[in-house]
């Protein structure tokens, strides 16, 4: 048992059917000695009484808020969660595998640009009686700190039957160094709370990994002269890092038909501009990677051709 | 060519050659995500390996101020990669495919560090750590680990030599 | 006061379903967990299993595990225990009982229902 | 699964004697052991849990000890009402077991 805040406690079970339950004594915060009962959640039923409580916690029914009274009077509270180990794994119910980039990815992260700053999201079917707690650091043994914002409900969506609810969480790094190589990985770390249920989701990942710019921007078509080629032009994106000349992209530009089986013509440039030739009912796009490093293309920025 | 003690390299051939690092440390190692190399500990592995990091002067205002740090720093990092490439990880089983791009990649990571000290001039270099997976599987491993570490490497580089050829050429 | 109350005795033919129920009150239903313990005539108790009120999650004793099944109704604080098909060694009283939370075992039974199972 | 033996499987006494019911568990149950009294025609009724707790309104002549795989149910002091048959149960590891039952008799 541990402390997950203030007289809040996770248990930690062993979950297969012949798992003794876990022992747990509850102590009562008081200097008083004599005429203490206790009670769960809203139940006035006594179940027990003294200083300690001792239980056995084995199933969610054992979980809840234990409350130790003295003369119809509230001393201190306890409230135990349960994380659930199956077969020497940690239980993750409460948040959904987002498959992408491989299986058991519970959180995603991506960042804009090197300044440290990092948005990390994950999917629930779950809709209430829902907690998360964001912790973060550049890494583990002599962490550097990292400061999250709280999560929240950042879309809902319909899957079939289900209705999917995303959680996100803004991140930045303390002292963060753009320019340098990263030597330690950020850690993420997610409390996740469901009822009495809890359960933790970490992601390690450096920030030049999880890269993702933002689609060029003010993308423009300039005709030329007596010739069905056209200028594309484009800026980088405001949130990418500056100066350009030390944190440069390079792009891709592309020519799309109507019908997505036309035959797409690609051009990959570092320049912020490229000669194409537009086809009728076509539509130019371009997007943008760090230059360097190989990490996620941005989204398309997209114009039609006439 | 760059003289150590203060004239500048060759930024734009520095520049050039840098980027060509870039585009065959991926085509070397393109299995980004595929396979994260952290899960497998990375303990005597990469934390040996020189990193630019943030006292290095390598930021574009660092190098305005004294490009010679930066550079110096480069330059072991570099002689390290081209000392791990050519060391019996890469040459042992399992032998590499015949068109690799890993000999190129030892030849340029060779050519950029030449580009930065010419015969004559010595910066001190990083001893590098005696590396010997008994398995085949641990030179595997350890190649994979040390491509995706370069692959960080000469993107900063990379970037150095790109701000310095745009704003630090004469 | 805690009270489970328990439905009337039943005689079956092999072969029928039954459902019997077990309707608590007096106490927080959400709070505790129902069981069902068995007693076959003149013999010792059998544990069959505990449900939770909340979001039917159950433990089975492997040897009932596919021979009855537990089910619960939030709404009326009722249990109910069933069999697709009966057989004449499902002949026996039940309890339904509940299960005091951070222990395990029974504090407070229903008076029991007699199942008779016979051709 | 546990397997819960109880001795005797009959016991003797008078009222106003001292009855002694031992349980045995096939391997350790901690202290998470219980026991019942079951009346004829009545259902069971908690004595003591966790070994040696009375339950709530249970007459204080009634005691538990014992853990591990031991455990000891006493009367100090046998009342008419109290000729029954006691059984124990472990509730430490599924599926939750009862022991065979004592009958405690007028002797």
């Known amino acids: 048992i541990w402390e997950l805040k203030k007289d809040v406690y996770v248990v930690e079970l062993d979950w297969y059917p012949d798992a003794p339950g876990e022992m747990v004594v509850l102590t009562c915060d008081t200097p008083e000695e004599d005429g203490i009962t206790w009670t769960l959640d809203q139940s006035s039923e006594v179940l027990g009484s003294g200083k300690t409580l001792t239980i056995q916690v084995k199933e969610f029914g054992d979980a809840g808020q234990y409350t130790c009274h003295k003369g119809g009077e509230v001393l201190s509270h306890s409230l135990l969660l349960l994380h659930k180990k199956e077969d020497g794994i940690w239980s993750t119910d409460i948040l959904k595998d987002q498959k992408e980039p491989k299986n058991k990815t519970f959180l995603r992260c991506e960042a804009k640009n090197y300044s440290g700053r990092f948005t990390c999201w994950w999917l629930t079917t779950i809709s209430t009686d829902l907690t998360f707690s964001v912790k973060s650091s550049r890494g583990s043994s002599d962490p550097q700190g990292v400061t999250c914002g709280a999560a929240t409900l950042s879309a809902e969506r319909v899957r079939g039957d289900n209705k999917e609810y995303e959680y996100s969480v803004e991140c930045q790094e303390d002292s963060a160094c753009p320019a340098a190589e990263e030597s330690l990985p950020i850690e993420v770390m997610v409390d996740a709370v469901h009822k009495l249920k809890y359960e933790n989701y970490t992601s390690s990942f450096f920030i030049r990994d999880i890269i993702k710019p933002d689609p060029p921007k003010n993308l423009q078509l300039k005709p030329l002269k007596n010739s069905r080629q056209v200028e594309v032009s484009w800026e980088y994106p405001d949130t990418w890092s500056t100066p350009h000349s030390y944190f440069s992209l390079t792009f891709c530009v592309q020519v799309q038909g109507k019908s997505k089986r036309e035959k797409k013509d690609r051009v990959f440039t570092d320049k912020t501009s490229a000669t194409v030739i537009c086809r009728k009912n076509a539509s130019i796009s371009v997007r943008a990677q760090d230059r360097y490093y190989s990490s996620s293309w941005s989204e398309w920025a997209s114009v039609p051709c006439s | 060519r760059a003289v150590p003690g203060g004239s500048s390299p060759a930024w734009t051939q520095c520049q050039q050659l840098s980027q060509k690092l870039c585009t065959l440390a991926w085509s070397a190692h393109p299995l980004v995500g595929h396979m994260d190399l952290r899960e497998e500990g990375d303990e005597e592995t990469t934390n040996d390996v020189p990193h630019i990091q943030c006292g290095d002067g390598c930021d574009p205002q660092g190098l305005r101020d004294n490009s010679q740090f930066c550079l110096q720093r480069i330059h072991q990092g570099l002689i390290f990669y081209e000392k791990l490439l050519g060391s019996d990880i890469f040459t042992g089983e399992p032998s590499l495919l015949p068109d690799s791009p890993v000999g190129q990649l030892h030849a340029s990571l060779l050519g950029l560090s030449q580009l930065l000290q010419p015969e004559g001039h010595h910066w001190e270099t990083q001893q590098i750590p005696s590396l010997s997976p008994s398995q085949p599987w641990q030179r595997l491993l350890l190649r994979f680990k040390i491509l995706r570490s370069l692959q960080a490497f000469v993107a900063v580089a990379a970037r150095v030599f790109a701000h310095g050829a745009a704003t630090l050429s004469p | 006061e805690v009270q489970l109350v328990q439905s009337g005795a039943e005689v079956k033919k092999p072969g029928e379903s039954l459902k019997i129920s077990c309707q608590s009150s007096g106490y927080s239903f959400t709070t505790y967990w129902i069981g069902w313990v068995r007693q076959m005539p003149g013999q010792g108790l059998e544990w069959i299993g505990i449900?939770?009120?909340?979001?039917?999650?159950?433990r089975y004793n492997p040897m009932f595990r596919g021979q009855v099944t537990m089910s619960v109704d939030k709404s009326s604080s009722t249990a109910y225990l069933q069999w697709s098909s009966l057989k004449a060694s499902d002949t026996a009283m039940y309890y339904c009982?509940?299960?005091?939370?951070?222990?395990?075992?029974?504090?407070?039974w229903g008076q029991g229902t007699m199942v008779t199972v016979s051709s | 699964e546990i397997v819960l033996t109880q001795s005797p499987a009959t016991l003797s006494a008078s009222p106003g004697e001292r009855a002694t019911i031992s349980c045995r568990a096939s391997q350790s149950v901690g202290s998470w052991l219980a026991w019942y009294q079951q009346k004829p025609g009545q259902a069971p009724r908690s004595l003591i849990y966790?070994?040696?707790n009375l339950q709530s309104g249970i007459p204080a002549r009634f005691s538990g000890s014992g853990s591990g795989t031991d455990f000891t149910l006493t009367i100090s002091s046998l009342e008419p009402e109290d000729f029954a048959v006691y059984y124990c149960?472990?509730?430490?590891?599924?599926?939750?077991?009862f022991g065979q039952g004592t009958r405690l008799e007028i002797k």
């Open positions: 966790a070994a040696s």
């Open positions: 449900m939770s009120p909340v979001d039917s999650d159950i």
């Open positions: 009982a509940r299960r005091r939370p951070g222990q395990g075992y029974f504090d407070f």
């Open positions: 149960q472990q509730y430490n590891i599924y599926p939750y077991t």
